[in-house]
Interface confidence: medium
Amino acid sequence: ARNGDDCPLGPGRCCRLHTVRASLEDLGWADWVLSPREVQVTMCIGACPSQFRAANMHAQIKTSLHRLKPDTVPAPCCVPASYNPMVLIQKTDTGVSLQTYDDLLAKDCHCI
Amino acid sequence: ARNGDDCPLGPGRCCRLHTVRASLEDLGWADWVLSPREVQVTMCIGACPSQFRAANMHAQIKTSLHRLKPDTVPAPCCVPASYNPMVLIQKTDTGVSLQTYDDLLAKDCHCI
């Protein structure tokens, strides 16, 4: 995977990790999560130009076919390649519990 | 994962498996693949409206934040959830070889 500095569209415009600050209200979690009150959500955002961070052979195929039929075949999309775990303190009937979520915060990104 | 018939945008418009016929020339493979001459490429195409085939918690977060900040946070994207293997007969210096690719054809789809 090439790094974000290789982006042919200009610095920072290609698929990479971004952080978006979100409150429990933003996420619709206010009624079942106690803590944290705010989450630094890491997610994958940006363009996937030809062969940039291509995840696999499928992504390469998608790039080729998108060029031939842009109205039919979508370009590859910037999505998480792996995740960081996050612990949420949740409300329960009996009080609170700690729950680890393995698929909540993107760790790094690729195009697929 | 809900099936494609639940698509709120109309039948067949949401994230689902499509087949696109492609020749070796279309894929740019003519110089290194002998067979098959044509590939039925299965790929994931379609919209990902709210919570449709959400792959995980991250996809749910993305949906929430996209609604709040559509210019900043993209909607979830329709990508393969798993793949079917495919065997290609390749040209080599000494003749031909059979190579199995595990990440070439999408098997089913989800939104992430």
Partner: antibody, heavy 119, light 111 residues
Framework: QVTLKESGPGILQSSQTLSLTCSFS??????????VSWIRQPSGKGLEWLAH???????RYNPSLESRLTISKDTSRNQVFLKITSVDTTDTATYYC???????????WGQGTTLTVSS | DVVMTQTPLSLPVSLGDQASISCRSS???????????LEWYLQKPGQSPKLLIY???NRLSGVPDRFSGSGSGTDSTLKISRVEAEDLGVYYC????????FGGGTKLEIK
């Protein structure tokens, strides 16, 4: 060089079927990425995209007219065809064919053929 | 379907002036690879349309550099830096990212 030329009946009566032919040279519809579209323009009005056929016989239609349109091709004769059923006076227009190359844009157009539908 | 709205409908200019035509799409026509399949065509009186600009800002070979395209997301603009007599006609934007659609056209004419 690339050229495209449209031909058609010129005049039709309402409810008849329109058959148009686009004859082209300078490229082949067997080449990956190539396609041909039909586009029409009523006199003094704007352009309306009708249909597109890809090199692999994949077809696209304007959804508002899809039930009346059929696009086809004869690759060996370098021709693309369009049929429009049940024409009426609103189909009176100049009909163009245009080549859609890589990434979809129309780099070459025919000079157009005029159709008048009389009631 | 994507609706392409062009403004203005008519643009009276003096020769040598700059001209600017806007095209707005009803939804984003940006693909996730950064491509936007947005084109500009010029149709001179009695002629077929001719491609000027493709992928928002790329000039077709042979098109004078006084023509430039820009834009992102749903908004695109065609600028002509110094209008010449041969530039007069109707300009159309077109998107090929979704079901293909043309804008309604903008007539560039002498003031």
């Amino acid at each position: 060089q690339v050229t495209l030329k449209e031909s058609g009946p010129g005049i039709l009566q309402s409810s008849q079927t329109l058959s148009l032919t686009c004859s082209f040279s300078g490229f082949s519809l067997s080449t990956s990425g190539m396609g041909v579209s039909w586009i029409r323009q009523p006199s003094g009005k704007g352009l309306e995209w009708l249909a597109h056929i890809y090199w692999d016989d994949d077809k696209r239609y304007n959804p508002s007219l899809e039930s009346r349109l059929t696009i086809s091709k004869d690759t060996s004769r370098n021709q693309v065809f369009l049929k429009i059923t049940s024409v009426d006076t609103t189909d009176t227009a100049t009909y163009y064919c245009a080549r859609g190359g890589y990434d979809g844009y129309y780099d070459y157009w025919g000079q157009g053929t005029t159709l008048t539908v009389s009631s | 379907d994507v609706v392409m709205t062009q403004t203005p409908l008519s643009l009276p200019v003096s020769l040598g002036d700059q001209a600017s035509i806007s095209c707005r799409s009803s939804q984003s026509i940006v693909h996730s690879n950064g491509n936007t399949n947005l084109e500009w065509y010029l149709q001179k009186p009695g002629q077929s349309p001719k491609l000027l600009i493709y992928k928002v800002s790329n000039r077709l070979s042979g098109v004078p550099d006084r023509f430039s395209g820009s834009g992102s997301g749903t908004d695109s603009t065609l600028k002509i830096s110094r209008v010449e007599a041969e530039d007069l006609g109707v300009y159309y934007c077109f998107q090929g990212s979704h079901v293909r659609t043309f804008g309604g056209g903008t007539k560039l004419e002498i003031k």
